[in-house]
């Protein structure tokens, strides 16, 4: 009865190739770039999405101050190595044998090194701070209405359980959404906060990953909420390890 069954497409990931060659002729979808089978009734992992993207043809303030360990994804796109479950491998290397360690959202958390670099474990990003600036409006949005709408969005559009949306802060025109999810809180089948944040980031940029769904149409009491810039901070369960020269 799912859309994927009816016409053999993946409603939650347009970067797939689908065919009715699953068990019993069921629709099965595989991610571009990796060929990994994906579950179209949940979000696809960020690692598989990045890999698919790289394989595609090229075309008293209430605001939170991110602490000194917060990471921003300054390195941009790369073609990641994913494990069989679609998670980022702890060590990533490029074609020129430059390697680095990443966290669970694929953001670099060490200096770059060579092939001898060791990344003992995939460190979990347990706290994500999404920092948005909205376009000017006639007046400020009502905070509780904004809070409710953003919680609804993550619950309905990204399948993220409400308990993982820790807070929504607002000081016009800045909105901050805090997502928190410890290793112990995330169980099999639950959407990862990193994947939800990535889908949201792509939606805000007008690059929706959903198939056959309209783009993001955020409204607070009927008033359009248009985002003009986004910055995402990632906090890991273990602080990152950068040398001092990076900080100067």
């Amino acid at each position: 009865h799912t859309a994927a069954q009816d016409n053999c497409t993946c409603p939650t990931n347009k970067m797939t190739v689908c065919s009715p060659d699953g068990p019993g002729g069921r629709c099965q979808c595989r991610a571009l770039g990796s060929g990994v089978a994906v579950d179209c009734s949940t979000l696809t992992s960020k690692c598989l999405l990045l890999k698919a993207r790289m394989s595609a043809p090229k075309n008293a303030r209430t605001l939170v101050r991110p602490n000194e360990h917060a990471l921003v994804d300054n390195d941009g796109l790369y073609d990641p190595d994913c494990d069989p479950e679609g998670r980022f491998k702890a060590r990533q290397c490029n074609q020129t044998s430059v390697c680095w360690c990443v966290n669970s959202v694929g953001v670099r958390r060490t200096d770059k090194g060579d092939l001898s670099l060791r990344c003992d474990e995939l460190v979990r990003t347990h706290h994500i701070l999404i920092d948005l600036r909205h376009r000017p409006t006639a007046g400020a949005f009502n905070h509780s209405d904004l809070d409710a709408e953003l919680r609804r969005l993550f619950r309905e559009r990204y399948r993220l359980h409400p308990k993982f949306v820790a807070a929504v802060h607002y000081e016009q025109p800045t909105i901050q959404i805090e997502l928190r999810q410890n290793t112990s809180q995330k169980a099999a089948g639950d959407v990862d906060i990193g994947d939800a944040a990535y889908y949201f980031e792509r939606d805000v940029k007008g690059e929706s990953l959903f198939q056959g769904r309209g783009g993001l149409d955020l409204r607070v009491r009927g008033e359009p909420l248009q985002v003009e810039r986004t910055l995402i901070y990632y906090l890991d369960e273990i602080p990152p390890k950068f040398s001092m020269k990076r900080l100067t």
């Epitope: 009865h1 799912t2 009734s41 949940t42 399948r159 959407v191």
Partner: nanobody
């Protein structure tokens, strides 16, 4: 293979009540979220009520206060108690499940569906 079987539908006068049931079989885990959806002739399928593994619930605004979703994990059964029924509640009602813990009423997140049970409310 997971299977869902609904029951409890029927015809009722406006203002009346019905209780729908849905028996789940074939799951090897208890970590699945469940929901009731409905589809009236010529209309899109819409989410009515959902329940997660922690028994938190969510409802379509037009049924909140009239409908109650609940689940009995031991009996692997989902229920929908429908009170103060209105003619606009007339539809085929479907039970659905999705792996993991979530609270959403978008059909895209649910991968197993029952065959449905008809509810008809006359004025």
């Amino acid at each position: 293979q997971v299977q869902l079987q609904e029951s409890g539908g029927g015809s009722v006068q406006a203002g009346g009540s019905l209780r729908l049931s849905c028996v789940v079989s074939g799951y090897t885990t208890t970590r699945y979220s469940m929901a009731w959806f409905r589809q009236a002739p010529g209309k899109e399928r819409e989410g009515v009520a959902g329940i997660d593994t922690d028994v938190l619930t969510t409802y379509k605004p037009s049924v909140e206060g009239r409908f109650t979703i609940s689940r009995d994990s031991a009996k692997r059964t989902l229920y929908l108690q429908m009170n103060s029924l209105k003619p606009e509640d007339t539809a085929m009602y479907y039970c659905a499940t999705g792996t993991g813990n979530f609270l959403a009423l978008d059909p895209v997140w649910y991968n197993t569906w029952g065959q449905g049970t008809q509810v008809t409310v006359s004025s």
